[in-house]
């Protein structure tokens, strides 16, 4: 059997026998274009493609539409994989989305959506989510139905105020909504009463800025 040399996601890498977490090269669907991603091969059976990670504030997430489209940061640390790749990938097959959260008191929680995809750029990478379970709130902190993606230079939210400019970071803002995992990073003891921090309302309420976040996807049939 010929060995697979290109992989569209971390699930394919895992199934090929490469089961160590780390940076791998993925290929855009129906293309030869490549992108580097962090693969989590340990959490919940492995095979997770990490699409977002925050941990220390080392990377500026107040970026342009183009940067969020193409991705930025380092897959070994804080990064955004890229809306275009995620849109193309999740448009091909059914994916689940897992969001892992850490607070400053040592607690961890997660939200799992059993179907996740991003629409194309022509639809402003609108997010589609169904089937929420997990420990980070019974209600989705990403507004439903899904919103268009907004950045500081591309305002597609439902608020006259330009949420991305005011709250910092690119996100699927509503008006402005109960979450923003790409908000400003605040260190410990400066992380409460912050309207523009890393927010997941239905776990920590309003004004609490989280310590670490990871968004990861995997095929639903993995």
């Amino acid at each position: 059997k010929e060995e697979q040399t290109t992989f569209r996601d971390c699930a394919e890498i895992f199934k090929s026998g490469l089961t160590t977490s780390g940076i791998y090269t993925l290929t855009f669907p129906n293309s030869t274009e490549e992108i580097k991603a962090y693969c989590d091969m340990d959490v919940g059976g492995g095979g997770w493609t990490v699409i977002q990670h925050r941990e220390d504030g080392s990377v500026d997430f107040q970026r342009t539409w183009k940067e969020y489209k193409e991705g930025f940061g380092s897959p070994l640390g804080e990064y955004w994989l890229g809306n275009e790749f995620v849109s193309q990938l999740t448009g091909q097959h059914r994916y689940v989305l897992k969001i892992q959260l850490k607070d400053w008191e040592g607690n961890e929680a997660h939200s799992l959506y059993d179907h996740f995809y991003l629409a194309g750029e022509e639809s402003n990478y609108r997010i589609h989510l169904t089937g929420l379970t997990g420990t980070a709130g019974k209600i989705s902190s990403i507004s439903q139905p899904g919103s268009d993606f907004s950045t500081k230079d591309s305002d597609n939210d439902k608020c006259i105020c330009k949420c991305s400019q005011m709250l910092s970071g690119g996100w699927w803002f509503d008006a402005c909504g109960p979450s923003n995992l790409n908000g400003q990073y605040y260190p410990q003891k400066q992380n409460t009463n912050k309207f523009n921090g890393i927010k997941w309302y239905y776990w920590k309420g309003s004004g609490y800025s989280l310590k670490a976040t990871t968004m990861m996807i995997r095929p639903a049939d993995f």
Epitope: L167, F195, G205, G207
Partner: antibody, heavy 118, light 107 residues
Framework: QIQLVQSGPELKKPGETVKISCKAS????????MNWVKQAPGKGLKWMGW????????TYADDFKGRFAFSLETSASTAYLQINNLKNEDTATYFC???????????WGQGTSVTVSS | DIQMTQTTSSLSASLGDRVTISCSTS??????LNWYQQKPDGTVKLLIF???SLHSGVPSRFSGSGSGTDYSLTISNLEPEDIATYYC?????????FGGGTKLEIK
């Protein structure tokens, strides 16, 4: 429509306690925090702090730490402000105001007048 | 704490006038400024948030502008129901602080 209805005027003596209520309607109570604002007679507005209606955690401005307490009755969509050991300088109108994402007070109660006099 | 200064405590204008109320801050607040209206009966309403964003239901004759430490609220065509006291408020840093208010009266 969104409404915040506060309890009626209070006349108290120094040293007594007062508890003001603010009943919310027209929205999901736990989705928005609640601010409290003081206005002394003939004066401007002063922010006292806010309570996170989802977690129940209060935050007090420095001038309102000690004798002041914010609380909730979530099942009744009601926030409370309690002032203990009342002083003459607590004579004021107290407003509750809905907190929208931590950056604005978008709807206000009608205010509750508290008079402290011996 | 961030100090908010509304230098004009009262202002007289005629119906139909264009009125500007100013507010300055003791340090830069990155446009994190709101404007509130308090009617003579004590009722308080949000008018403008994030310096220039009009709250829902507020007439378009109200507008806000500014940056850094200097901000203003403009009423383009004064109407009788605009008689009120106007307060600016910053949310750049806790505690939230308000200006002293500008009372608007009809000439």
């Amino acid at each position: 429509q969104i409404q915040l209805v506060q309890s009626g005027p209070e006349l108290k003596k120094p040293g007594e306690t007062v508890k003001i209520s603010c009943k919310a309607s027209g929205y999901t109570f736990t989705n928005y925090g609640m601010n409290w604002v003081k206005q002394a007679p003939g004066k401007g507005l002063k922010w006292m702090g806010w309570i996170n209606t989802y977690t129940g955690e209060p935050t007090y401005a420095d001038d309102f730490k000690g004798r002041f307490a914010f609380s909730l009755e979530t099942s009744a969509s009601t926030a409370y402000l309690q002032i203990n050991n009342l002083k003459n300088e607590d004579t004021a109108t107290y407003f509750c105001a809905r907190d929208h994402d931590g950056y604005l007070m978008d709807y206000w109660g009608q205010g509750t007048s508290v008079t402290v006099s011996s | 704490d961030i100090q908010m200064t509304q230098t004009t405590s009262s202002l007289s204008a005629s119906l139909g006038d264009r009125v500007t109320i100013s507010c300055s801050t003791s340090q830069g607040i990155s446009n994190y400024l709101n404007w509130y209206q308090q009617k003579p009966d004590g009722t308080v309403k949000l008018l403008i948030f994030y310096t220039s964003s009009l709250h829902s239901g507020v007439p378009s004759r109200f507008s806000g502008s500014g940056s850094g430490t200097d901000y203003s609220l403009t009423i383009s065509n004064l109407e009788p129901e605009d008689i009120a006291t106007y307060y600016c408020q910053q949310y750049s840093k806790l505690p939230y602080t308000f200006g002293g208010g500008t009372k608007l009266e009809i000439k």
